[in-house]
């Protein structure tokens, strides 16, 4: 059965041609029996809100590559399942890419995008705190504090999928001042905008600011982690909470230092450095795979502080889900 699912070619990550992963290979889904109930489940699995349509997959560019296989002939969900893997399916028999299924979900807000294109918080601990930088014509610019408000911070936090904006007096780290051109001042956001770029502002690049006035923003980013499937709270398959959705962590690069950070964060003592076999006894997860290539020094207090690929970006299946066993 499919171990991963994604939408490709849409304007945002919550619409596009349906692709599923089997045995490390991404392929498409034939539109036999594909209906709004199937899309509802897919949208739920991707954290994309309600289903809004069943467009043809051929509408999305670039089209599926010729070498790419159609993997599933038909999908039949009741609409109540959490993932497509829980729905009735048939292996492909005869289907061309002209019949690829597509999906559109109602809630494509950029807060759901794992990699917002146009804004980032730089030089902070994690991607939800830091100096505001905005991309314009392929160049990153800082934002001047003049005219900045909590309403503007709300927009940035929403755009990044980082929860609520936190009121902070913190200034940018002097050693990490922006070395980029200063983009804008006089941001006047209502707080309801989808992206910072939608807020009215002064003219591009025309201001009298210096980098002492770069804007710092902090968002809540409700991050949490848990171990599931074990006999106690200190052993099991690792799941992390991101954007309100629990997902697993891929074991690429995972080792003892990463184990220690998890055990420390959970207050579970030290890692028992379990064998590969012991780690596999908790079984594979379902749903999202949130993290891949996690790298910790071992000094971190939270897994969130470790390096990792962008949230939701991975080349893993649930057979590679990390499990951790702590001393308790």
């Amino acid at each position: 059965s499919p171990s991963g699912v994604r939408l490709v070619g849409g304007l945002h990550r919550c619409e596009g041609r349906v692709e599923v992963e089997q045995k490390g290979q991404w392929g498409t889904v034939c539109d036999d029996g594909w209906d709004i109930k199937d899309v509802a489940v897919l949208c739920r699995e991707l954290g994309c809100g309600a289903a809004s349509g069943t467009p043809s997959g051929i509408l999305y560019e670039p089209p599926a590559e010729k070498e790419q296989k159609v993997l599933i002939q038909s999908v039949s969900c009741t609409g109540t399942e959490d993932t497509l893997a829980q729905c009735e399916q048939e292996e492909v028999y005869d289907c061309s890419h002209d019949e690829d299924a597509g999906a559109s979900c109602e809630n494509p807000e950029s807060s759901f995008s794992p990699v917002p294109e146009g804004v980032r918080l730089a030089d902070g601990p994690g991607h939800c705190k830091g100096r505001v930088e905005v991309k314009h014509q392929n160049q990153w610019y800082t934002v001047c504090q003049t005219g900045w408000s909590l309403r503007a911070a709300k927009v940035v936090c929403r755009q990044l999928g980082c929860g609520r904006a936190v009121l902070t007096q913190k200034r940018c780290n002097k050693h990490a001042y922006g070395r980029k051109p200063i983009w804008l001042s006089q941001m006047s956001c209502s707080g309801r905008e989808a992206t910072l770029q939608d807020c009215p502002s002064g003219p591009w690049g025309k201001n009298t600011c210096n980098h002492d006035e770069d804007t710092w923003v902090e968002c809540e980013d409700p991050f949490d982690l848990r171990l599931v499937g074990g006999d106690n709270l200190c052993s099991g398959r690792l799941e992390v909470l991101h954007k309100g959705v629990w997902g697993s962590v891929c074991d690429d690069n995972w080792g003892e230092k990463e184990d220690q950070v998890v055990c420390k964060q959970l207050g579970c003592g030290k890692s028992l450095s379990p064998s590969f076999r012991d780690r596999k006894c908790y079984g594979p997860g379902v749903g999202r795979i949130w993290l891949d290539n996690v790298r910790c020094s071992g000094e971190e207090q939270s897994l969130e502080q470790c390096q990792h690929r962008f949230w939701g970006f991975h080349d893993c299946t649930h057979q590679e889900d990390v499990a951790v066993i702590c001393s308790g």
Partner: antibody
Framework: QSVKESGGRLVTPGTPLTLTCTVS????????INWVRQAPGKGLEWIGI?????NTYYASWAKGRFTISRTSTTVDLTMTSLTTEDTATYFC????????WGPGTLVTISS | ELVLTQTPSPVSAAVGGTVSISCQAS????????CSWYQQKPGQPPKLLIH???KLASGVPSRFKGSGSGTQFTLTINDLECDDAATYYC??????????FGGGTEVEIN
């Protein structure tokens, strides 16, 4: 990719019987299996299906007397309260497009 | 409950000729399952010819053609050969995993 039925034999009315469909070359985790029967000299009659996630659906006339179950590589058809009317060749076939079919197994109900 | 009615039966035609077999559904067949056609020879299991109303199964000659939608479907066999003598069945589903077969049409080749 193939399927093959087994377990057909001569039984007396009322005797329960289980037929087995053994699959090879494909996985039941992403394929459904149908059971179909054909009385001598008659047409094809659909009995029921077990889907990749184990859900079962039956023809209205088959509900109650016929039960479909599976393991990782086999699908069983259990039949109860058999009468002479159930004498037929029983086939299994994959998915909603019914391909491939097995050679069939003959069930004869006679006193 | 879905009922599929096939006509005519039997049907006779000469080698090189054409036959058409009709399959009438009691209610509109699910728009994605459509209708399938099968060929069965004595002592053998059925063989898939056409699925989704008009798609030719792998290895089936293009002399076999399926058409139709909704409640009315047709199988046409052109350039008949002796080997086409068989019984042909249609099958359909309503998208709820409940399927049915037509009564079958015997094709005789003169």
């Amino acid at each position: 990719q193939s399927v093959k039925e087994s377990g057909g034999r001569l039984v007396t009315p009322g005797t329960p019987l289980t037929l087995t469909c053994t699959v090879s070359g494909f996985s039941l985790s992403i394929n459904a299996i149908n059971w179909v029967r054909q009385a001598p000299g008659k047409g094809l009659e659909w009995i029921g299906i077990i889907t990749n996630i184990g859900n079962t659906y039956y023809a209205s006339w088959a509900k109650g007397r016929f039960t479909i179950s599976r393991t990782s590589t086999t699908v069983d058809l259990t039949m109860t309260s058999l009468t002479t009317e159930d004498t037929a060749t029983y086939f299994c076939a994959r998915n909603s497009y019914f391909d491939p079919w097995g050679p069939g197994t003959l069930v004869t109900i006679s006193s | 409950e879905l009922v599929l009615t096939q006509t005519p039966s039997p049907v006779s035609a000469a080698v090189g000729g054409t036959v058409s077999i009709s399959c009438q559904a009691s209610q509109s067949v699910d728009s994605n399952n459509y209708c399938s056609w099968y060929q069965q020879k004595p002592g053998q299991p059925p063989k898939l010819l056409i699925h989704k109303a008009s798609k030719l199964a792998s290895g089936v000659p293009s002399r076999f053609k399926g058409s139709g939608s909704g409640t009315q479907f047709t199988l046409t066999i052109n350039d008949l050969e002796c080997d086409d003598a068989a019984t042909y069945y249609c099958a359909g589903g309503l998208g709820d995993n409940i399927y049915a077969f037509g009564g079958g049409t015997e094709v005789e080749i003169n």
